[in-house]
Structures are given as C-alpha cells and as structure tokens.
Amino acid sequence: HSDGIFTDSYSRYRKQMAVKKYLAAVLGKRYKQRVKNK
C-alpha cells in the first residue's frame, strides 16, 4: 500500500488507547471483585 504510513494516525492511536483503558478498568474491576469474594 503506497500510503501505508497514514494508517498510523492519531485518531487510530486514541481509539486504541481508549480500548486499552476500558479493558484495564474492566479487568481491574473483575480482579477487585475476585479478591473481595475470597
């Protein structure tokens, strides 16, 4: 793809960061719940 560099865009990066943040929050919540239930 001749314009491959443009796939590494800031908007795509922000979306990836938002997904990471969401997953971290969900996994963190699950972990806390597991600890609480022990």
Epitope: I5, T7, S9
Partner: antibody, heavy 112, light 110 residues
C-alpha cells in the same frame, strides 16, 4: 514513548548511527520518523520507516541517511558521511505524517 | 518536491489578542486534510497541537483552532496567554509517504 541516543561529536566523513528506542507500542504497527533541527533553525523531516519494513526519505536525504529497524524496539538512523551541515538535534517521532509522540532529541556535532 | 510555506515568519500580539498563522502547500496534502500543527519552545521537542487540519490533540486548549483543506491551512490562537509564546510549525503528509515541515512562525506575546 520514544528515546533517541547516540548523538556525539564526530569529524566530517565519519559514519554515525543514532538509535530510537520505543516502548509502549509495537514497531510492526507504527510509523517512525527522524526529524532534525539545526541550531536556531526550523524542523526538517529526514525520513520514515513504516511498520518496521519500508523506509521513505526526503529527496535531499536520499543516499545521505539510512533508516532501518534493528530490533523489535529499536530503529536506527545512519548518517553515511556527515558534513558540518549535519550538525543538529535529531528527533525520533511516531506517527504517519502527524507526529503525536516525540523524543527529547540527541545532539550531533560535526566538526573537524 | 512539495513545499510548505508558513507566513508570517514572526508575529507579535498582546495578551488576550488573536494571531493567525498561514501554511500554504505547493501540492495538496494526503486526503486533503493531512496537515498538523506543533508548538515548540526553546530546548524542548515540538508539542503536537492539531491533526488532520482541524482536530485538537488531547489536552490542547480550545483557544487553538485549525482550519483549511487541500493546499491552504490556518492556525488561529485566540485569547493569547504569555505561555503561548513559542515557535509554531505546520507539517503536511503527502501521497508517496512523504512529509514536509513549514519554516516556522515565531509568536511573541506582549
């Protein structure tokens, strides 16, 4: 984040290699550029490596610089035969033509 | 080869005022909007301000506004603050995976 290293004082004609070390993202999905700034001057784009594979250069930089991926976390900039005109701070920056992560830069001085 | 021309090279304005910086490209940028803006202070790396011509990067105040398309772009800074004193650069991305920077505009805040 990105971090540059390797800047030093060199004599004209002595090849020099600068290294950009990345963390927190994969080179296989990123575009990484080298940008330089001579003392008191503006920003000058040298070239870019896309997804760690293909390299593209500014027309003035072709043959003078080589950008290559050297490990899963490092990209090198080789200055083939430095001249005094290459004295500058060299920055590594992530992004495909829009640079959203910058390093602090590494200073290269070319002098006899 | 593409050329990005920034005007003016220097501009001075009072605190609370407005400055406008122009960036003209010799050819259309990728997708007609692949133009970004940066702020740089002495001894520091550039700071990413605006992407795809008009979108504000995270944490950048809404006093900064980017506009334009194709070959003609503008950065407007309103309600100027002392902290806005810096050099501003535009950068364009072009088909063929080529990038270029404008020559920079020094903003002096009085």
């Amino acid at each position: 984040s990105v971090e540059e290293s390797g800047g030093r004082l060199v004599t004209p004609g002595t090849p020099l290699t600068l290294t950009c070390t990345v963390s927190g993202f994969s080179l296989s999905s990123a575009a990484l550029s080298w940008v330089r700034q001579a003392p008191g001057k503006g920003l000058e784009w040298i070239g870019i490596i896309d997804k760690g594979v293909m390299s593209y250069y500014a027309s003035w930089a072709k043959g003078r610089f080589t950008i290559s991926k050297t490990s899963s976390t490092t990209v090198d900039l080789k200055v083939t035969s430095p001249t005094t005109e290459d004295t500058a701070t060299y920055f590594c920056a992530r992004g495909g033509g829009e640079f959203f992560i910058w390093g602090q830069g590494t200073l290269v001085t070319v002098s006899s | 080869a593409q050329v990005l021309t920034q005007t003016p090279s220097s501009v001075s304005a009072a605190v609370g005022g407005t400055v406008t910086i122009n960036c003209q490209s010799s050819k259309s940028v990728y997708n007609n909007n692949w133009l970004s803006w940066y702020q740089q202070k002495p001894g520091q790396p550039p700071k990413f301000l605006i992407y795809q011509a008009s979108n504000l990067a995270s944490g950048v105040p809404s006093r900064f506004k980017g506009s334009g398309s194709g070959t003609q772009f503008t950065l407007t800074i309103s309600d100027l603050e002392c902290d806005d004193a810096a050099t501003y650069y535009c950068a364009g991305g072009y088909s063929g995976n080529i990038v270029g920077f404008g020559g920079g505009t020094e903003v002096v805040v009085k």
